[in-house]
Amino acid sequence: TFFQKPESCPPVPGGSMKLDIGIINENQRVSMSRNIESRSTSPWDYTVTWDPNRYPSEVVQAQCRNLGCINAQGKEDISMNSVPIQQETLVVRRKHQGCSVSFQLEKVLVTVGCTCVTPVIHHVQ
Amino acid sequence: TFFQKPESCPPVPGGSMKLDIGIINENQRVSMSRNIESRSTSPWDYTVTWDPNRYPSEVVQAQCRNLGCINAQGKEDISMNSVPIQQETLVVRRKHQGCSVSFQLEKVLVTVGCTCVTPVIHHVQ
């Protein structure tokens, strides 16, 4: 797998690897159009979760506001569906016992925003 | 910072830390078998980038198909805007020289999908 050494090399001691300090592109920032969460036809709110033993400590989850989508009159149109757009992301967990600190990667499912879709006829019609 | 040991502890040798093997929730998956990218009123396409020295090796970027949004008649309505939804995510870079393998975190900006918004009137007045 990705984290294993080549077969011809001695195995990693204690099931851990070397993680270099410093993050490439650490200061890179999202520059989204402003207030898209409230201007969208499938608007959303944000919920922030905070964990001091996770990097990044702050993870933001979007929550669609409506079942349907907002039409030109500003009313909810239930013939269309607001749906979440999700993304798998990696975070780093910090585990410490005294001065012994180790880190582990964790996969987190983040809802980034919402989009308006034409419905597929499921059970809800 | 997050990756530093407490001040009372001896510094990390060689500017690296211990990364435990294995990923928490590794098998967690986005349930995107829903074709929302083509059913959206702000549809998008995907481009896949592949890098064997990155985890995950595959990073998917979305590109909005239209400037405007698709109306009920399936036509582009230029009075509304399709805009990208972006998310910062972490990936892991693998660096190796012979049997010496180390890893480093990297921030990557991913466009996850698109949403349809009411335009903000800017410079066009």
């Epitope: 959303w44 709110d45 919920t47 979760t49 989850q61 979007a62 929550q63 669609c64 506001r65 409506n66 079942l67 349907g68 909810e76 239930i78 569906n81 607001s82 749906v83 979440p84 999700q86 499912l109 983040v110 809802t111 879709v117 419905p119 597929v120 499921h122 059970h123 809800v124 | 349930s31 829903r34 929302i36």
Partner: nanobody, 123 residues
Framework: QVQLVESGGGLVQAGGSLRLSCAAS????????MGWFRQAPGKEREFVAA????????KYTDSVKDRFTMSRDYAKKQVYLEMNSLKPEDTAVYYC????????????????WGQGTQVTVSS
């Protein structure tokens, strides 16, 4: 793991009313909609109603429109189903569940259901 506890079912005469409650715990930060579903003997489970946690907007299946009203208490993470003018064909076990994709959620995506609450309408 989402935990769901439904209550409020019972035996009622046609034309009567019941109020079902559902307590949900373990919801993710992105959970935005809840639904009521029902399963009559020998039939498949079907959608009854849905509500948005934030806006309170609702959607109903045609057969219960104007008779059932779904509401929610966002702070308590509870949803309710007010059932009026009940008919014998409303007899079923009623379940609530998170709708992670709102109205786009498919029945086959559900892994976990609560125990449900039995509603029996006699004629």
């Amino acid at each position: 793991q989402v935990q769901l506890v439904e209550s409020g079912g019972g035996l009622v005469q046609a034309g009567g009313s019941l109020r079902l409650s559902c307590a949900a715990s373990g919801l993710t930060g992105s959970s935005y909609a809840m639904g009521w579903f029902r399963q009559a003997p020998g039939k498949e489970r079907e959608f009854v109603a849905a509500i948005s946690w934030i806006s309170g907007g609702t959607k109903y299946t045609d057969s219960v429109k104007d008779r059932f009203t779904m509401s929610r208490d966002y702070a308590k993470k509870q949803v309710y189903l007010e059932m009026n003018s009940l008919k014998p064909e409303d007899t079923a076990v009623y379940y609530c569940n998170d709708m992670p994709y709102g109205l786009d959620t498919r029945m086959d995506e559900y892994v976990y259901w609560g125990q449900g609450t039995q509603v029996t309408v006699s004629s």
